[in-house]
C-alpha cells in the first residue's frame, strides 16, 4: 500500500513540475527591465526565451519573437537546449511511469517489469528536473553577469554613441517557476525511484530437497514446512523434517521402496 | 549594431518651418523611445519631444505648440516638424533611440551625430 501510495505520489508531483517546466519555457517574463528613468512614457521591457516584450503606462504591450537562431547569445541557446532536453525527458517518463503504476493493470505485466519502468521514469524525471535547474540557473548566472557588468559606453563613432541603458534589471517570474518546477519533478522522480525498491519482487528460493520416508507413517511437525528465502534461519540447508526429510547435501541413497524423487 | 542618422537640418528664417528626420539602421530587433535633444552653444542637452513605441508623446513646454513629433514604426523613422521657429532654437538637434538588443541581451541608447538648426532674426 505504501509502495503504491509513494508510487503514485511521485508520479502527480513530477506531472506537475514537468507542466511547470513546459510553462517556464514559454513563459514571457524570464528577464524585466524597469525603465522608470525614460523620459518619455515609464516602460517595462521583458524577455523569454522565444520573444521579448514591451509594456507601456499607456498600456501598449508588443512582443517581437527572436526570429532568427544567429545574434542571440550562446548562453540563450544553451537554455533553451536544457529546457527543451527536460520537457522531453519529462513527457517520455510520464509516459512510461502510467504504464508502471501498480493501480493500473495492462495484460499481464509482471511486477519486476513494472519494477523496472518504475525505475526508468523515476530516472528520466531526475535528469528532467535537473535539466531544468541547471537551465534557469544558467540564465540567471547570464543576466547577474551581463548587468553587473560596466554600463560605460560601448562605442563612439562618427559623432553618435551607443550606451547600455541604466535600468533596474530584475529575475522574472519565470525563473522562480522554473525552479520550483525543476525542484518538483527532481522530487517525483527520487520518490519513483524508492518506490521501484518496494516494487521489485523478493527472490524466493526454494531448496532442492529430496524426502526419505523411513517407513509408511511419517510424523510430519505442523507448520514444518518452511520455503526457504535466504533471510530465515534456514540457510545452511539443515534439515526441516524430523522424518527423514535430508537436503541434497546430506542425501545418502538407500535404495527403497517408499523414496520420492 | 544600431545607428540612427538626422537629417533636415539647416538654415531658416524666423518664424518660417523646418522637419527635421531620424532614420535608424542596422541589426535593429526592436526600438522602444524615441527622442529629439538639442544643444545650443554654452548649455546642456535637453529633451525636446520624445514619442514611444505605442505612440506616447512627451514635449518640453518651450516648444508645446509649435512642434509635433511623429514617428513611423515599421520604418524605424521619427519626424520632428518644427513651426513658428524662433531664435531660441538655434542648436545642434540630437536623435535619440533606446533598443532591445537580443544579441547582447541588453538595453541600448543610441546616439546620432547631430544636425544643425540655425534660425536667423
Known amino acids: 500500500m505504501a509502495v503504491t501510495a509513494c508510487q503514485g505520489l511521485g508520479f502527480v508531483v513530477s506531472l506537475i513540475g514537468i507542466a511547470g517546466i513546459i510553462a517556464a519555457t514559454c513563459m514571457d517574463q524570464w528577464s524585466t527591465q524597469d525603465l522608470y528613468n525614460n523620459p518619455v512614457t515609464a516602460v517595462f521591457n521583458y524577455q523569454g526565451l522565444w520573444r521579448s516584450c514591451v509594456r507601456e503606462s499607456s498600456g501598449f504591450t508588443e512582443c517581437r519573437g527572436y526570429f532568427t537562431l544567429l545574434g542571440l547569445p550562446a548562453m540563450l541557446q544553451a537554455v533553451r537546449a536544457l529546457m527543451i532536453v527536460g520537457i522531453v525527458l519529462g513527457a517520455i517518463g510520464l509516459l512510461v511511469s502510467i504504464f508502471a503504476l501498480k493501480c493500473i493493470r495492462i495484460g499481464s505485466m509482471e511486477d519486476s517489469a513494472k519494477a523496472n519502468m518504475t525505475l526508468t521514469s523515476g530516472i528520466m524525471f531526475i535528469v528532467s528536473g535537473l535539466c531544468a535547474i541547471a537551465g534557469v540557473s544558467v540564465f540567471a548566472n547570464m543576466l547577474v553577469t551581463n548587468f553587473w557588468m560596466s554600463t560605460a559606453n560601448m562605442y563612439t563613432g562618427m559623432g553618435g554613441m551607443v550606451q547600455t541603458v541604466q535600468t533596474r534589471y530584475t529575475f522574472g517570474a519565470a525563473l522562480f517557476v522554473g525552479w520550483v518546477a525543476g525542484g518538483l519533478t527532481l522530487i517525483g522522480g527520487v520518490m519513483m525511484c524508492i518506490a521501484c525498491r518496494g516494487l521489485a519482487p523478493e527472490e524466493t528460493n526454494y531448496k532442492a530437497v529430496s524426502y526419505h520416508a523411513s517407513g509408511h507413517s511419517v510424523a510430519y511437525k505442523p507448520g514444518g514446512f518452511k520455503a526457504s528465502t535466504g533471510f530465515g534461519s534456514n540457510t545452511k540447508n539443515k534439515k526441516i523434517y524430523d522424518g527423514g526429510a535430508r537436503t541434497e547435501d546430506e542425501v545418502q541413497s538407500y535404495p527403497s521402496k517408499h523414496d520420492y524423487v | 549594431e544600431v545607428q540612427v542618422q538626422e537629417s533636415g537640418g539647416g538654415l531658416v528664417q524666423a518664424g518660417t518651418s523646418l522637419r527635421l528626420s531620424c532614420a535608424a539602421s542596422?541589426?535593429?530587433?526592436?526600438?522602444?523611445?524615441m527622442g529629439w535633444y538639442r544643444q545650443a552653444p554654452g548649455k546642456q542637452r535637453e529633451l525636446v519631444a520624445g514619442i514611444s513605441r505605442g505612440g506616447t508623446t512627451t514635449y518640453a513646454h518651450s516648444v508645446k505648440e509649435r512642434f509635433t513629433i511623429s514617428r513611423d514604426n515599421a520604418k524605424n523613422t521619427m519626424y520632428l516638424q518644427m513651426n513658428s521657429l524662433k531664435s531660441e532654437d538655434t542648436a545642434g538637434y540630437y536623435c535619440?533611440?533606446?533598443?532591445?538588443?537580443?544579441?547582447?541581451?541588453?538595453?541600448?541608447?543610441?546616439w546620432g551625430q547631430g544636425t544643425l538648426v540655425t534660425v536667423s532674426a
Open positions: 535619440n533611440a533606446q533598443a532591445w538588443d537580443p544579441g547582447t541581451f541588453r538595453y541600448l541608447e543610441v
Open positions: 542596422g541589426n535593429i530587433f526592436r526600438i522602444d523611445t
